[in-house]
């Protein structure tokens, strides 16, 4: 696994412990919390990052209307179970034996149950809608410049293949970035849209996962873009399975008539 040889750190994941104990004295980095060896030439999976985070000390509309099956991560942080490849296990349980099924980005897609709950497969999140509101700026953003800059960001910083950035919508002050990646489209070595979205989410919260870099400085023709709020919608290849109770107001949170809750990331 590649890492910076000189000081043996992981450029793409600061939540690691690195040492020159790889083959031939090469630098090898392991994710905090899980001890899994990570590839520092690409993004670390969201599952391993969440696990590391939990182990760390605490401190005329042109915009897209989210599909009725869109999920939003309303449950917040949890300590996930990851498979040997670093993917989320389809079934997640907490210490009190409450279990639920998740999608490939680790967001709950069923009601909570007990240990008898079955999650047959890990359902892929194939469409992610990142909804941002930017802070007022002295100079206006041109849509095509903004589009180009965001595509460049996902390509260069998150190493996401350009074909997976489906669209960038802009209706001041709202920006929407659509990421799409079907199972059949994702080749070996391709960054997962869920991982790219998670790195981006942490960046816009001022919690960069990259080693030793300052915060993300995003500019459009020199004009800085500052994000005031972020909301991320996840759409799965198979719609989520929630009981009617949740849809008719019995569930927690807002937006009870849709298969999502509005969860604001500040």
């Amino acid at each position: 696994h590649t890492a910076a040889q000189d000081n043996c750190t992981c450029p793409t994941n600061k939540m690691t412990v690195c040492s020159p104990d790889g083959p031939g004295g090469r630098c090898q980095c392991r994710a905090l919390g899980s001890g899994v060896a990570v590839d520092c030439s690409t993004l670390t999976s969201k599952c391993l990052l969440l696990k590391a985070r939990m182990s760390a000390p605490k401190n005329a509309r042109t915009l897209v209307r989210p599909n009725e099956h869109a999920l939003v991560d309303n449950d917040g942080l949890y300590d996930p179970d990851c498979d040997p490849e670093g993917r989320f296990k389809a079934r997640q349980c907490n210490q009190t034996s409450v279990c639920w099924c998740v999608n490939s980005v680790g967001v709950r897609r069923t009601d909570k149950g007990d240990l008898s709950l079955r999650c047959d497969e890990l359902v892929r999140t194939h469409h992610i809608l990142i909804d941002l509101r930017h802070r007022p700026t002295a100079g206006a953003f041109n849509h095509s410049d903004l589009d180009a800059e965001l595509r460049r960001l996902f390509r260069e910083r998150y190493r996401l293949h350009p074909k997976f950035v489906a669209a960038v919508h802009y209706e001041q002050p709202t920006i929407q970035i659509e990421l799409r990646q079907n199972t059949s489209q994702k080749a070996a070595g391709d960054v997962d849209i869920g991982d790219a979205a998670y790195y981006f989410e942490r960046d816009v919260k001022g919690e960069s996962l990259f080693q030793g870099r300052g915060g993300l400085d995003l500019r459009v023709r020199g004009e800085p873009l500052q994000v005031e709020r972020t909301l991320i919608y996840y759409l799965d290849e198979i719609p989520p399975k929630f009981s009617m109770k949740r849809l008719t107001g019995g569930g927690s949170g807002g937006g009870s008539h849709h298969h999502h809750h509005h969860h604001h990331h500040h």
Partner: antibody, heavy 122, light 106 residues
Framework: QVQLVQSGAEVKKPGASVKVSCKAS????????INWVRQRPGQGLEWMGW????????KYAQKFQGRVTMTVDTSTSTVYMELSSLRSEDTAVYYC???????????????WGQGTLVTVSS | EIVLTQSPATLSLSPGERATLSCSAS?????IYWYQRKPGQAPRLLIY???NLASGIPARFSGSGSGTDYTLTISSLEPEDFAVYYC?????????FGQGTKVEIK
């Protein structure tokens, strides 16, 4: 540490041009914009414009449009501000200042160069 | 253009006293930036994004406000705090500064 060092004082005749340099060090030069601000004797601070070294984008104050030109030399991490058609009212101390920003915050103008006194006199 | 009006123009206080400087904008702005300038020196950033202390600035300085009214407070004046203070907006072009408030020793 981040530092901006400006060229020395200049004395110019009315109608002439002046070119002030600002050399940056201690940070990735292309990662923030360089602003120019002047202070005339006994007056307040007046923003003239900025240039973004990464792509050469620039924004000038309307008041100076047509008279000011900001350029960048990335090989030497230097920004230049040229003011033409000088008049006596342009006598001032000219400052360069960098502005760092992230998606979370705009960190203001910090630090500033030491200032360059430009005197316009016949 | 947005005009920033600072008051008072001059503030005469003694070391140890509390200084309250005001900055009023001609139209609503989202954030204000505060700078200190001493004779023969370049301005120094004190506060960014209305209330955040710039690097290396003592905690006796604080900023607050919203809309059109903003305040810089120095909780207990030190001898080195006697200077001219400027507010600045980044809401619309041209970027503008207030005319300054001079804090002098009484």
């Amino acid at each position: 540490q981040v530092q901006l060092v400006q060229s020395g004082a200049e004395v110019k005749k009315p109608g002439a041009s002046v070119k002030v340099s600002c050399k940056a060090s201690g940070y990735t030069f292309t990662s923030s914009d360089i602003n120019w601000v002047r202070q005339r004797p006994g007056q307040g601070l007046e923003w003239m414009g900025w240039i973004y070294p990464r792509d050469g984008s620039k924004k000038y104050a309307q008041k100076f449009q047509g008279r000011v030109t900001m350029t960048v030399d990335t090989s030497t991490s230097t920004v230049y501000m040229e003011l033409s058609s000088l008049r006596s009212e342009d006598t001032a101390v000219y400052y360069c200042a960098t502005r760092f920003a992230t998606v979370v915050s705009n960190y203001g103008l910090d630090p500033w160069g030491q200032g360059t006194l430009v005197t316009v006199s016949s | 253009e947005i005009v920033l009006t600072q008051s008072p123009a001059t503030l005469s206080l003694s070391p140890g006293e509390r200084a309250t400087l005001s900055c009023s904008a001609s139209s609503s702005v989202n954030y204000i930036y505060w700078y200190q300038r001493k004779p023969g020196q370049a301005p120094r950033l004190l506060i960014y994004d209305t209330s955040n202390l710039a690097s290396g600035i003592p905690a006796r300085f604080s900023g607050s406000g919203s809309g059109t009214d903003y305040t810089l407070t120095i909780s207990s004046l030190e001898p080195e705090d006697f200077a001219v203070y400027y507010c600045q907006q980044w809401n619309s072009y041209p970027l503008t500064f207030g005319q300054g408030t001079k804090v002098e020793i009484k």
